[in-house]
């Protein structure tokens, strides 16, 4: 089973665009666009801070931490109204992701 050029293996993703805005003090806004080839029952999400195919139920229920979106050793918490999640590093630094 060979993949054509540009074709993704089932269940995998690739980043196709990334943008960082550091114009605001003490705040960096990062946006990322990914292309995913998800299997039936999966949808594009984030695992270990990278684009990944995740169980579609996670997206439907907005249980974002079930994607395991944070790096190993970080703590994941849902934002109010389940509008996204935070990843808290051992040192206390917090990274917030909002879903749009």
């Amino acid at each position: 089973q060979f993949l054509k050029e540009g074709q993704l293996a089932a269940g995998t993703c690739e980043v196709i665009a990334a943008h960082r805005d550091s114009s605001q003090p003490r705040r960096t806004i990062a946006r990322q666009t990914a292309r995913c080839a998800c299997r039936k029952g999966q949808i594009a999400g984030t695992t270990r801070a990278r684009p990944a195919c995740v169980d579609a139920r996670i997206i439907k229920t907005k249980q974002w931490c079930d994607m395991l979106p944070c790096l190993e050793g970080e703590g994941c918490d849902l934002l109010i109204n389940r509008s996204g999640w935070t990843c808290t590093q051992p040192g206390g630094r917090i990274k917030t992701t909002t879903v749009s």
């Epitope: 089973q1 293996a9 089932a10 269940g11 995998t12 993703c13 299997r39 695992t47 270990r48 990278r50 990944a52 195919c53 139920r57 996670i58 229920t61 249980q63 931490c65 079930d66 395991l68 944070c70 190993e72 050793g73 970080e74 703590g75 994941c76």
Partner: antibody, heavy 120, light 107 residues
Framework: QVQLQESGPGLVKPSETLSLTCTVS????????WSWIRQPPGKGLEWIGY???????NYNPSLKSRVTISVDTSKNQFSLNLKSVTAVDTAVYYC??????????????WGQGTTVTVSS | DIQMTQSPSSLSASVGDRITISCRAS??????LNWYQQTPGKAPRLLIY???TLQSGVPSRFSGGGSGTDFSLTITSLQPEDFATYYC?????????FGQGTKLDIK
């Protein structure tokens, strides 16, 4: 170094409920998925199910009507309940950590296993 | 459910030999395949994930390959501690299914 330890009764009577607990030490239960697997005497491995940090689950359809997996993050434990057991449920039961290696979910840390015999 | 079929079911070999175990999925699973080693009385140990990536701490004499429906595990220069039962497992669908196992023993 993450370690898993299964605990629970080694003997269960037919028609009763098998209850096992897996205690996770050396790491947070919230950062992974967790799984139960069993192995009948002299046979191969059978996947029972997963649990996610939120408590959401995926079960093997062959056992779905009888199985419940739950998580207690405050105790760093997850549990297996299998109701209405019969002799065919006699097996070594393993708990395992499910690691998302990029896109490839694999069970990379296992408990040592606990033998459960179903007999009157 | 996806069925996983291993061959052979048992295999006899000698220390220093090179052996290959095959695993076939009943439908395409891309490279979502793991290999485990189990010695008697012990829990399984992850050897390879993603069909070909060696798990940390696993000796380089182990290698995996394949994609789609056909996969293989190769051990070059067998060591005494390699005589065990080997299982493949797919991670593409629910339920996760294992192959029936391949028992490798000393000739």
């Amino acid at each position: 170094q993450v370690q898993l330890q299964e605990s629970g009764p080694g003997l269960v009577k037919p028609s009763e409920t098998l209850s096992l607990t897996c205690t996770v030490s050396g790491g947070s239960i919230s950062s992974y998925y967790w799984s139960w697997i069993r192995q009948p005497p002299g046979k191969g491995l059978e996947w029972i199910g997963y649990i996610y940090p939120s408590g959401s689950t995926n079960y093997n359809p062959s056992l779905k009507s009888r199985v419940t997996i739950s998580v207690d993050t405050s105790k760093n434990q997850f549990s297996l309940n299998l109701k209405s057991v019969t002799a065919v449920d006699t097996a070594v039961y393993y708990c395992a950590r499910v690691n998302p290696f990029g896109y490839y979910y694999a069970m990379d840390v296992w408990g040592q296993g606990t033998t459960v015999t179903v007999s009157s | 459910d996806i069925q996983m079929t291993q061959s052979p079911s048992s295999l006899s070999a000698s220390v220093g030999d090179r052996i290959t175990i095959s695993c076939r999925a009943s439908q395409s699973i891309s490279t979502s395949l793991n290999w485990y080693q189990q010695t008697p009385g012990k829990a399984p140990r992850l050897l390879i994930y993603g069909a070909s990536t060696l798990q940390s701490g696993v000796p380089s004499r182990f290698s995996g390959g394949g994609s789609g429906t056909d996969f293989s595990l190769t051990i070059t220069s067998l060591q005494p501690e390699d005589f065990a039962t080997y299982y493949c497992q797919e991670s593409a669908s629910i339920p996760r299914t294992f192959g029936q196992g391949t028992k490798l023993d000393i000739k």
